[in-house]
């Protein structure tokens, strides 16, 4: 009978929303496959000391360190971390294993260090050592992919110089426009670095690692498509590679393609051609213009000409530094309570921006869409008609941009009242900002029509709650009104609201809402 290793150490990485964290089950249901930490007997150590592979954890990640003891019967255990003993509750599974777990929720610097686990089984004692550190994501990078021609082959290599090593995939689509959205059935993904099929309509390369995903589209001029109303523009930074693909389809092979920069033919070695027959026996030709590392003098109009198609051009602009061009002046909007409305920012940027929309200290995902004129647009519609300040923030490697929006929702005032021994105050958040009146209710004026003008102090927009203005009015108490009911009314173009207050003794006062439209 040959012996199996008694101790198995595993790491379970929990997804952030994982409800199974900290729960035990007969055969633990885990959010992701447990990673074997290869617990090995420590050489030159007295007794049975096992050492697990070092564990690197992202800040705020949740993990479970787990030890499986393949030994029959009961075990007892103790965790020690930074000289403190931690409670240890083994459970036993259906595979006859003792299972000991240490859950670390939302990893922080203070939770990094050496975790020692002492296990006593019916037969032997074991010591298991885990070393947990925080992954240094400061060294992480995710760079936009770029293209290179494969040596001696008509193929493109996609490169992303990122840390950790990214997964590179080609995203191909053969239809037009909207149907080439990421999750469309027309989109084909190939998880490889080299692409040989370069005739497709839309070709992108994406790289992804722990920091996210970055994509680069192969800039294409299609001579069979009607040219855009504005000249397509391609921005590049000095030193970056330039790739433009010119594509044309014709009934037979009797046509040729050429590239010119500012009416001068491109030099040999700066272009290569490929051709193929399509399913309906028409000929597809593509001609690539490329410069491995652009300089300022590569700026200009690149024109693709064909003996059988009208020529088309693109303006290539080489910049020293990235940019974000947009108007940053703040914008105020006033809408009705059920009116459909979206904030939008139109910008031109290179490299592509990362952006967020923020409201009330909460960030929302930001989508951007390219327009035909070289501009992009980002819209935000998810405001749920909450008035206040909305912020659009965009950045790329070289530039930052912030734009403020204020949203006002037209609605009739709602009044809240409070009173103290010396004064009564009313507050309202209606828009447009309301005006105030105070009225005294007495025997002479049972309908509270007697207006109070003395001792009234109005503060318009004195309190900003996430950009939402609040108006208030305060009435200083005088002997003339003590013991009476008073009514404060806020009114704007959409209606009036009132609140009645009894001015008698200090303390909280009951008040009756009295809505008048």
């Amino acid at each position: 009978n040959q012996d199996l290793p008694v101790i198995k150490c595993v790491l379970i990485n929990h997804k952030n929303n994982d409800s199974s964290v900290g729960k035990s089950s007969s055969y633990p249901m885990v959010s992701e496959s447990p990673e074997d930490l290869g617990c090995a007997l420590r050489p030159q150590s007295s007794g049975t000391v096992y050492e697990a592979a070092a564990v690197e954890v992202d800040v705020s990640a949740s993990i479970t360190l787990q030890v499986l003891v393949d030994a029959p019967g009961n075990i007892s255990c103790l965790w020690v971390f930074k000289h403190s003993s931690l409670n240890c509750q083994p459970h036993f599974d259906l595979q006859n294993r003792g299972v000991v777990s240490m859950v670390i929720l939302k990893m922080t610097e203070t939770q990094a260090g050496e975790y020692l686990l002492f296990i006593q089984s019916e037969a032997t004692n074991y010591t298991i050592l885990f070393t947990v550190s925080i992954r240094n994501t400061l060294l992480y990078t995710l760079r936009r992919p770029y293209f290179r021609k494969m040596e001696n082959q008509d193929a493109l290599v996609c490169i992303s110089e990122s840390v950790p090593e990214p997964i590179v995939e080609w995203v191909l689509c053969d239809s037009q426009g909207e149907s080439c959205k990421e999750e469309s059935p027309a989109v084909v993904k190939k998880e490889e670095k080299v692409l040989h099929e370069l005739f497709g309509t839309d070709i992108r390369c994406c790289a992804r690692n722990e920091l996210g995903r970055e994509c680069t589209r192969l800039f294409t001029i299609d001579l069979n498509q009607t040219p855009q109303t504005t000249l397509p523009q391609l921005f590049l930074k000095v030193g970056e590679p330039l790739w433009i693909r010119c594509k044309a389809v014709h009934v037979n092979h009797g046509f040729g393609l050429t590239w010119e920069l500012e009416n001068k033919a491109l030099e040999e070695g700066n272009y290569f051609e490929m051709s193929t027959y399509s399913t309906n026996r028409t000929m597809i030709r593509i001609l690539f213009a490329f410069v491995s590392s652009v300089a300022r003098n590569d700026t200009g109009y690149y024109t693709c000409s064909s003996s059988k198609h009208p020529s088309q051009s693109a303006l290539v602009t080489i910049v020293e530094k990235g940019f974000i061009n947009a108007t940053n002046s703040s914008e105020d909007y006033e809408i009705d309570q059920y009116e459909e409305f979206c904030f939008s920012v139109r910008f031109k940027a290179y490299p592509q921006i990362r952006c967020t929309w923020t409201f009330s200290r909460k960030s929302f995902p930001c989508e951007q869409k390219g327009l035909d004129n070289g501009y992009s647009i980002s819209k935000f519609c998810n405001h749920k008609h909450q008035p206040g300040e909305y912020i659009f923030h965009a950045e790329n490697d070289d530039a930052q941009f912030t734009k403020m929006f204020t949203l006002n929702i037209r609605r009739k005032p709602q009044v809240l009242a409070e009173a103290s021994a010396s004064q009564a105050s009313c507050f309202s958040d209606g828009y447009p900002l309301p005006s105030w009146t105070w009225k005294k209710c007495s025997d002479k004026s049972p309908n509270c029509t007697e207006e109070i003008t003395e001792g009234v102090w109005n503060r318009k927009a004195n309190r900003k709650v996430f950009g939402q203005w609040v108006s208030s009015s305060t009435l200083n108490m005088s002997e003339a009104i003590k013991g009476f009911l008073v009514k404060c009314c806020a009114y704007n173009s959409l209606g009036t609201s009132c609140e009645t207050i009894l001015l008698n003794s200090p303390g909280p006062f009951p008040f009756i809402q009295d809505n008048i439209s």
Epitope: G73, F92, L94
Partner: antibody, heavy 118, light 109 residues
Framework: EVQLVQSGGGLVQPGGSLRLSCAAS????????MSWVRQAPGKGLEWVSG????????GYADSVKGRFTISRDNAKNSLYLQMNSLRAEDTALYYC???????????WGQGTMVTVSS | QSVLTQPPSVSAAPGQKVTISCSGS????????VSWYQQVPGTAPKLLIY???KRPSGIPDRLSGSKSGTSATLGITGLQTGDEADYYC??????????FGGGTKLTVL
Amino acid sequence: EVQLVQSGGGLVQPGGSLRLSCAASGFTFSSYAMSWVRQAPGKGLEWVSGISWNSGSIGYADSVKGRFTISRDNAKNSLYLQMNSLRAEDTALYYCAKVGGGGAFDIWGQGTMVTVSS
Amino acid sequence: QSVLTQPPSVSAAPGQKVTISCSGSSSSIGDNYVSWYQQVPGTAPKLLIYGNNKRPSGIPDRLSGSKSGTSATLGITGLQTGDEADYYCGTWDNSLGGVFGGGTKLTVL
């Protein structure tokens, strides 16, 4: 000699109940997880239920969940399977098995036949 | 439908070598040990291999087991007529509990 001796099988009508027993000897029963495995006539093996040595972990196959209950009595070296709401598809030869190293079933009972038929 | 996939049958002449494959998933074979069982018709299953490649005492070294990723293999060399039986692979699944293959009938020609 290490062995598992089963009893309690028989013929039962659909909707009926039956309790299977498995008596262990020759090893420290209270230190090992145990399982029930069944085999329908002419078919393969199907794991039915399992229980850890201290009854702290219990598991069932989806096909029997809510109808079968596994239990053990370490003082009596015995494993049990209470089967309720029996169906025709529960007809099988039921084996009790000891769980050994690597989670393998290293000792098997002789099997007991359960026939569910009207 | 078994969680683990085995070929329904294999055959070889006496003295030959035969292999039986068993494929599963990352949550079954990928994360757990594989065991192999022999069942002669009319008898209870018998453990042949545990822990992917270990033999219990009394099991000859003609039998071997291996595991790679989410697949496992049982090998029998020097086939004998007494090896004719049904062979099952088994393991545990992180969410299903115990799981078996559908069984492979070994015929010695």
